[in-house]
C-alpha cells in the first residue's frame, strides 16, 4: 500500500483535508480544506446562476449544491436540478424563476460527495444580487434647438432600477456620466450641432427594491449629430439594436415578475 498522509506544517497552518493513519477508513477526521465560495446572481429576476471555481479543488470533484430559504414557507432543502459544468466538472447551479424568492434569506450549501462532512453554507440576500438586462430601444428626440432627450426601456420593473447615462462627442477623450433615477429618461440641455454625440445607458437594481452593486451591461450605443441631425433638424429617433436573449440562455420560456408581486414581496 502506497497511500498518502496529509499533514499541517507550522503553527499557522490548518490540518489538511483528511489525515490518514493506520486507523480504519471510517475514522478519518473531518476535512478542513475550504470549499470554494459560491457566487450567485439573479438575472433580471428570470433565472439565477450560483457558480463556484471548480479549479480550486486539488482533485477533480463534482461538488453538489443544496439550497433552501431560511425562516419561510420555502425552508425545505432542495437539490440542484440543473447543474452548470466547466470541463465536465460541476461549477454551478441554475435556478429558474419559480425557485427564486427575492425577499427571503437564501441559504446555499456546497458539499463534497467524496467527503460528505466537508460542506460549507452561505446565506445570501437575493434582492442585492439582481442584475438587469441592458437597457433597450434607446431613442433620441430634440426638445428644442439645443436640447436633446434620451429615452430607453428596460425589460423589468422600471421603478426598481436606477440608471447611469454616459455620453461624449467625437472630440472628447472620456465619457461624461449622469445618474438617473427610475424615470429612465435623460435630458441634455446644451447640444453643439457641429458635433456627433454618442450615448449609452446601464441600469442597476437599486435602491427602491434592493441594494445591488452590479450594473447591467451597457446598452448598444446611440448616436446623434453631424450629417444625420442636419437631415431632420426637428426630430431624430434611432432605435438601438435589441439584444436578443435566447430561450436556452433563459432556461426556457420566462415571465417577468409583476409590479404588484414585487411590491407585495418587498413590503413583507
Amino acid at each position: 500500500l502506497n497511500t498518502t498522509i496529509l499533514t499541517p506544517n507550522g503553527n499557522e497552518d490548518a490540518t489538511t483535508d483528511f489525515f490518514l493513519t493506520s486507523m480504519p477508513t471510517d475514522s478519518l477526521s473531518v476535512s478542513t480544506l475550504p470549499l470554494p465560495e459560491v457566487q450567485c446572481f439573479v438575472f433580471n429576476v428570470e433565472y439565477m446562476n450560483c457558480t463556484w471555481n471548480s479549479s480550486s479543488e486539488p482533485q477533480p470533484t463534482n461538488l453538489t449544491l443544496h439550497y433552501w430559504y431560511k425562516n419561510s414557507d420555502n425552508d425545505k432543502v432542495q437539490k440542484c436540478s440543473h447543474y452548470l459544468f466547466s470541463e465536465e466538472i460541476t461549477s454551478g447551479c441554475q435556478l429558474q424563476k419559480k425557485e427564486i424568492h427575492l425577499y427571503q434569506t437564501f441559504v446555499v450549501q456546497l458539499q463534497d460527495p467524496r467527503e460528505p462532512r466537508r460542506q460549507a453554507t452561505q446565506m445570501l440576500k437575493l434582492q442585492n444580487l439582481v442584475i438587469p438586462w441592458a437597457p433597450e430601444n434607446l431613442t433620441l428626440r430634440k426638445l428644442s434647438e439645443s436640447q436633446l432627450e434620451l429615452n430607453w426601456n428596460n425589460r423589468f420593473l422600471n421603478h426598481c432600477l436606477e440608471h447611469l447615462v454616459q455620453y461624449r462627442t467625437d472630440w472628447d477623450h472620456s465619457w461624461t456620466e449622469q445618474s438617473v433615477d427610475y424615470r429612465h429618461k435623460f435630458s441634455l440641455p446644451s447640444v453643439d450641432g457641429q458635433k456627433r454625440y454618442t450615448f449609452r445607458v446601464r441600469s442597476r437594481f437599486n435602491p427602491l427594491c434592493g441594494s445591488a452593486q452590479h450594473w447591467s451591461e451597457w446598452s448598444h450605443p446611440i448616436h446623434w449629430g453631424s450629417n444625420s441631425s442636419k437631415e431632420n433638424p426637428f426630430l431624430f429617433a434611432l432605435e438601438a439594436e435589441q439584444k436578443l436573449i435566447s430561450e436556452e440562455d433563459l432556461g426556457g420560456e420566462q415571465k417577468l415578475i409583476s409590479e404588484e408581486d414585487l411590491h407585495h414581496h418587498h413590503h413583507h
Partner: antibody, heavy 121, light 108 residues
C-alpha cells in the same frame, strides 16, 4: 509563460538532508487554483510523486507514504518559491528530482529542469 | 491508490509509422488521464491532458482517447524527435498522483 527553476546541491551524504528549491515565475505559489509538487525519477521506481503544497485560504500539504516522516515541503511567498527537504537520505533516494505545477485539468503542465541527486559519502 | 499500467514497456518503430501506447487504470478514472513525453536529460513534457485534449504547442500527430479504465496515446506518423519515453498519469483521485511505469519508444 510559467517557468520553474530548480536549485540545490546534487550530492548529499547518507543520513543527511536533501534540500532543493523551486523558484516560480509567471504564477504565484499562493495561487488558489494551482498546486506545487515534487516528483522524482529513478531507474528502479520510475516517476514517483513525493508530495505537494497548495494554498486555499491556508496552506495544505500532501505527502506520499513512501517518504512518510522524512519529507517537508515549504512554500515561501516572499520569494515566490517552494522547497523540498528530505531527511535521513539513503542511496535509495538517489534520483532526478523535479518540481512541477498542477494546472489545467489537474495535469502537471509545467516542470522544473530537474536536479540529479547522488547520495554518497 | 490507483495503479497505472502501461503497455508495452518498450517498442521499436520507424519514422512514419503509426504508434499506439496503452494505459490501464486499476479503477475508473473518468477522463482524468494525462500523457507526458520525456527525453534523456530533460523534464517530462505534457502532451495530452484530460485523456484527449492536446496541450498547446504539441503537434497534432499526437492524440489521446479513452475513458474509464482504458486509454490510448497515438502518434499518427512518427517523426525523429518523437523517440522518447512516454508516461501516463492519473489525476482523478489524488493524493497520491500516480504514473504508469513508462513506455520507451526506440528507433527500429
Amino acid at each position: 509563460q510559467v517557468q520553474l527553476q530548480q536549485s540545490g546541491p546534487g550530492l548529499v551524504k547518507p543520513s543527511q538532508t536533501l534540500s532543493l528549491t523551486c523558484a516560480i515565475s509567471g504564477d504565484s505559489v499562493s495561487s488558489n487554483i494551482a498546486a506545487w509538487n515534487w516528483i522524482r525519477l529513478s531507474p528502479s521506481r520510475g516517476l514517483e510523486w513525493l508530495g505537494r503544497t497548495f494554498f486555499r485560504s491556508t496552506w495544505f500539504y500532501d505527502y506520499s507514504l513512501s517518504v512518510k516522516g522524512r519529507i517537508t515541503i515549504n512554500p515561501d511567498t516572499s520569494k515566490n518559491q517552494f522547497s523540498l527537504h528530505l531527511n535521513s537520505v539513503t542511496p535509495e533516494d538517489a534520483a532526478v528530482y523535479y518540481c512541477a505545477r498542477t494546472g489545467r485539468r489537474w495535469s502537471l503542465d509545467y516542470w522544473g529542469q530537474g536536479t540529479l541527486v547522488t547520495v554518497s559519502s | 491508490d490507483i495503479q497505472m499500467t502501461q503497455s508495452p514497456s518498450s517498442l521499436s518503430a520507424s519514422v512514419g509509422d503509426r504508434v499506439t501506447i496503452t494505459c490501464r487504470a486499476s479503477q475508473s478514472i473518468s477522463s482524468y488521464l494525462n500523457w507526458y513525453q520525456q527525453k534523456p536529460g530533460k523534464a517530462p513534457k505534457l502532451l495530452i491532458y484530460a485523456a484527449s485534449s492536446l496541450q498547446s504547442g504539441v503537434p497534432s500527430r499526437f492524440s489521446g482517447s479513452g475513458s474509464g479504465t482504458d486509454f490510448t496515446l497515438t502518434i499518427s506518423s512518427l517523426q525523429p524527435e518523437d523517440f522518447a519515453t512516454y508516461y501516463c498519469q492519473q489525476s482523478y483521485s489524488t493524493p497520491p498522483i500516480t504514473f504508469g511505469q513508462g513506455t520507451r519508444l526506440e528507433i527500429k
